[in-house]
């Protein structure tokens, strides 16, 4: 059956049991996700805005899929294996009375049974599983996986040791302070800096030590994962964001409608197809797209390119290049090059690299 | 590539009997529910019936409940429905559609057949 | 039960407009909600799932938005291949239908 091909999931709840306090529910579902990550690489986050990978719904009767539920007893819950859309979805029948302890339907236990499912667990022949298909009230403070249950996650996800440090081929979150950590885009918004990472970006507000990472879904539900390239205008309060042969305009951090827009109408060629990196520099008013070994001038106030371009990245950013992941302007005076794990600040006015550092040098590593 | 090639529509008396075959093939059959949509002419779509991976649970639109019948051949990558007491309201195009997940319905369908016409009359 | 309710029913417009079809839910469905075109004589296509998931193969120029009972299907600029039916549907329920037609 299906599983997730990331170790790295988000869960939300979308709505409350009355049964309950609402702090009562998160907890109860915050130690249900803790029972599996505790035998398993998987981590579990909890998000309140955005599309989430696993959806935890009370609801009563028809519900919105093809399975209603059937009122007091019977069908407690249930949920969807992984995948996308429904996948992962667990429902919870809200003509039962959730409780936190043995009286009517213990959350806690009913959520670690349905979080099995919605991890790719079938129901279990052994009894003592928490994946045997029948409710059963065991006491929730000494309670503990079956061996059966164990076995069936490990083999679908492994043990906790394993994959900690992996490359991130699943749009699972990148570790922060991994060496080797790179970005597919950085800008400043105003006084904050914008790290885009596959389906997530970090946010560090100038000057101060913390960061907070967030999915791109949960800021611009209509933004697609993997930006590219990005880039602000201040002085307007836009953000420009590139994917493939499309951008996105943002402003006053709010998507504008219209958009996407094909990166054609700056005026590239017809053989450009995706952007690698942009920054806009508020002296010349101008942005500069970097694509390959190239890259393009673009005058900001007349909306169109400058003559002359593409130039070789190497020719005229002397030790940058011959290709970049992202750039950001800062301080007035520097363009910060991200290429892979390093990072270069390279001073425009002088024309030279004044420091190289780490790409996660920003983040107190 | 998936295909879904739906057969045995055709014209029928009121109070007649009909079973329409659907045949799947390039996805593994075994694994997903499976469903029955209907559109009568010039009308809109209308959910018939599903089943699902194993052919163990089925359900069925109200207007059908009791006189049509959803059934599976994994071994065959077949999929039928029985259909009896047909009315003339039962008049459509049928497709077969196939749902995106196995153990509970979607209620996605991602890949439809081209329909088998099923006609009711006097 | 739940019910759809898809508005407009008929729609005119012409190669290059933006234009927007709604679905309302009678109660919230979270963002379980797919949009379908359906071109004369043929099946129905998946365009949309997940509300404002786009299915592989589909053209950018479409979006959808939405969750709980409000949702809406947006064509940016229409080509002249977009002119059809547009279903949403839920589970079971399939909204009654749009008709986009030329101007």
């Known amino acids: 059956g299906p599983v997730w091909r990331k170790h790295y999931i988000t869960y939300r709840i979308n709505n409350y049991t009355p049964d309950m306090n609402r702090e009562d529910v998160d907890y109860a579902i915050r130690k249900a996700f803790q029972v599996w990550s505790n035998v398993t690489p998987l981590k579990f986050s909890k998000i309140n805005t955005g599309m989430a990978d696993i959806l935890v719904v009370f609801a009563r009767g028809a519900h919105g899929d093809f399975h209603a539920f059937d009122g007091k007893g019977g069908i407690l819950a249930h949920a969807f294996g992984p995948g996308s859309g429904i996948g992962g979805d667990a429902h919870f029948d809200e003509d039962e009375f959730w409780t936190t302890h043995s009286g009517g339907t213990n959350l806690f236990l009913t959520a670690v049974h349905e979080i099995g499912h919605s991890l790719g667990l079938g129901h279990s022949s052994d009894p003592k599983a928490v994946m045997f298909p029948t409710y059963k009230y065991v006491d929730i403070n000494t309670f503990r996986l079956s061996a059966d249950d164990i076995r069936g996650i490990q083999s679908l996800y492994g043990d906790p040791k394993e994959n900690q440090r992996l490359p991130n081929p699943d749009n699972s979150e990148p570790a922060l302070c991994d060496p080797n950590l790179s970005f597919d885009a950085v800008t400043t918004v105003g006084n904050k800096i914008f790290f885009f990472k596959d389906r997530f970006f970090w946010l560090k507000v100038s000057e101060r030590p913390k960061t907070s990472v967030n999915l791109i879904s949960s800021l611009w539900p209509t933004l697609p994962s993997g930006i590219e390239a990005a880039y602000e205008i201040e002085a307007r309060n836009q953000v420009f964001l590139f994917k493939d042969d499309k951008y996105w305009l943002i402003s006053n951090l709010r998507p504008e409608p219209n958009y996407p827009k094909s990166i054609h109408s700056f005026g590239f060629p017809n053989f450009v197809k995706k952007i690698d990196a942009a920054v806009f520099n508020p002296r010349f008013y101008r942005t500069y797209f970097f694509v390959d070994n190239q890259y393009w001038r673009y005058d900001e106030r007349r909306q169109m390119m400058d003559p002359g371009y593409p130039k070789l990245i190497t020719k005229n950013f002397q030790g940058i290049g011959p290709k970049i992941d992202a750039v950001f302007y800062s301080k007035n005076k520097y363009y910060y090059f991200f290429q892979g794990s390093n990072q270069f600040e390279y001073d425009f006015l002088l024309q030279r690299i004044t420091k190289t550092l780490k790409s996660n040098s920003w983040f107190g590593c | 590539e998936v295909q879904l090639l739906e057969s045995g529509g055709g014209l029928v008396q009121p109070g007649g009997s009909l079973r329409l075959s659907c045949a799947a093939s390039g996805f593994t059959f075994s694994w997903y529910w499976m469903h029955w949509v209907r559109q009568a002419p010039g009308k809109g779509l209308e959910w018939v019936s599903g089943i699902v991976s194993s052919g163990g649970t089925t359900i069925y639109a109200d207007s059908v409940k009791g006189r049509f019948t959803i059934s599976r051949d994994n071994s065959k990558n077949t999929l039928y429905l029985q259909m009896n007491s047909l009315r003339a309201e039962d008049t459509a195009v049928y497709y077969c559609?196939?749902?995106?997940?196995?153990?509970?319905?979607?209620?996605?369908?991602?890949?439809w057949g081209r329909g088998t016409l099923v006609t009711v009359s006097s | 039960d739940i019910q759809m309710t898809q508005s407009p029913s008929s729609l005119s417009a012409s190669v290059g407009d933006r234009v927007t079809i709604t679905c309302r839910a009678n109660q919230s469905i979270y963002t379980y909600l797919n949009w379908y075109q359906q071109k004369p004589g043929k099946a129905p296509e998946l365009l949309i799932y997940a509300a404002s998931s786009l299915q592989s193969g589909v053209p950018s120029r479409f979006s959808g938005s939405g969750s709980g009972t409000d949702f809406t299907l947006t064509i940016s600029s229409l080509q002249p291949e977009d002119f059809a039916t547009y279903y949403c549907?839920?589970?079971?329920?399939f909204g009654q239908g749009t008709k986009l037609e030329i101007k």
């Open positions: 559609a196939k749902d995106i997940r196995g153990a509970y319905s979607s209620g996605l369908f991602d890949f």
């Open positions: 549907q839920q589970a079971g329920i």
